[in-house]
């Protein structure tokens, strides 16, 4: 004999021994149909807010206040904002390993320095975990088949240096 | 800074449908959810329903049976239609962020022949 | 659906007085939200999370309570502070609101 339980629509529980379908009391929901009893709400208040509210057939969903982050599944922890030089991990805040930086405030990952000698330039600033470093003007790099001559020009004291 | 502003017809005949657009700025509507909330003149405010970042929904059943809330994310909007509208409907329409921290002005609504 | 009833209706208070407003839930809440509306205006979030005081708003306020039994008050009436208060409960759908305390100066 099939149980008039399995009837039961989301938003209600249904107890076998008195098989009739009633609503989910305020504050408590059933995301499934026929079970015995209806499940808390969950509460988002302090570092949590609300990103969905509880109804009879679902749970209430949390986020993080501003300046803060989720942590765990459903967001069951929060954490304070990453600061810049740092990036955020599974397992929290983590500082930018060395060569990397994050300049963002709360979001972004650590990414790589500027490699300024593959546009030919030097360094003119070493980056940090907060900053990219620095790349100066390119470098002048000449070939043996250059030839450089100096030669006097506007008058006395005048010279203007000419690659050819 | 965050913002929200009601628009839609000032009057409604009986039996009619009312559709209300909320439009918001500032904040993203796959973010934050939005509310409609009503107030009959001189009378307390009634939750009417949400709609949520991900498009969901919840309702007053109350008015569920006759309310529909919708949105179109790139125009930041998000729409109220009430039908077989009645006098009681009367009432200021509000649209509020999820958290009720921000609210719009407000439009009037008057249902009458 | 989670009844609130507020009480009294209306409060008349002479400046410099103490106020409190109830808000008694036919179920257990877990928290309690107010709001302040001034006669032609949207309300407002006054207090949330029961006792947290929204941005800007004076710290003569104060909220508290728990379970079916929450109040909102004020420490020493101003003429600023004339408005209609109303609480919310956020714990499940429908959200829904006290029919509201008239605060009026005497």
């Known amino acids: 004999v099939q149980n008039s339980c399995d009837n039961c629509q989301p938003g209600t529980f249904c107890r076998k021994y008195n098989p009739v379908c009633k609503s989910c009391p305020p504050s408590t929901f059933s995301s499934i149909g026929g079970q015995p009893n209806c499940n808390i709400c969950r509460v988002c208040a302090g570092y949590f807010r609300f990103k969905k509210f509880c109804s009879s057939t679902h749970n209430a969903e949390c986020e993080c206040i501003e300046g803060f982050h989720c942590l765990g599944p459903q967001c069951t922890r929060c954490e304070k904002d990453c600061r810049p030089g740092q990036e955020l991990t599974k397992q929290g805040c983590k500082t930018c390993s060395l060569g990397t930086f994050n300049d963002q405030n709360g979001t972004g990952v650590c990414r790589p320095w500027t490699n300024c000698s593959l546009d030919g330039r030097s360094v003119l600033k070493t980056g940090t975990t907060e900053k990219d470093v620095v790349c100066g003007p390119p470098v002048v790099s000449f070939s043996p088949s250059t030839t450089i001559s100096v030669t006097p020009e506007g008058g006395p004291g005048g010279h203007s240096l000419q690659v050819l | 800074q965050v913002q929200l502003k009601e628009a839609g017809p000032g009057l409604v005949q009986p039996t009619q449908t009312l559709s209300l657009t909320c439009t918001v700025s500032g904040f993203s509507l796959t973010s934050d959810g939005v509310h409609w909330i009503r107030q009959p003149p001189g009378k307390g405010l009634e939750w009417m329903g949400i709609i949520y970042y991900d498009g969901g929904t919840d309702y007053n059943s109350a008015i569920k049976s006759r309310l529909s809330i919708s949105r179109d994310t790139s125009k930041s909007q998000v729409f109220l239609k009430i039908n077989s509208l009645q006098t009681d409907d009367t009432a200021m329409y509000y649209c509020a962020r999820i958290h009720f921290d921000y609210w719009g002005q407000g439009v009037m609504v008057t249902v009458s022949s | 659906d989670i009844v609130l009833t507020q009480s009294p209706t209306t409060i008349a208070a002479s400046p410099g007085e103490k106020v409190t407003i109830t808000c008694r839930a036919s179920s257990s809440v877990s928290y309690m939200y107010w709001y302040q509306q001034k006669s032609g205006a949207s309300p407002k979030l006054w207090i949330y999370?029961?006792?947290k005081l929204a941005s800007g708003v004076p710290n003569r306020f104060s909220g508290s309570g728990s379970g079916t039994s929450y109040s909102l008050a004020i420490n020493t009436m101003e003429t600023e502070d004339a408005a209609t208060y109303y609480c919310?409960?956020?714990?499940?759908?429908?959200?829904?609101f006290g029919s509201g305390t008239k605060l009026e100066i005497k």
């Open positions: 919310q409960q956020w714990s499940s759908t429908p959200l829904t």
């Open positions: 999370d029961t006792s």
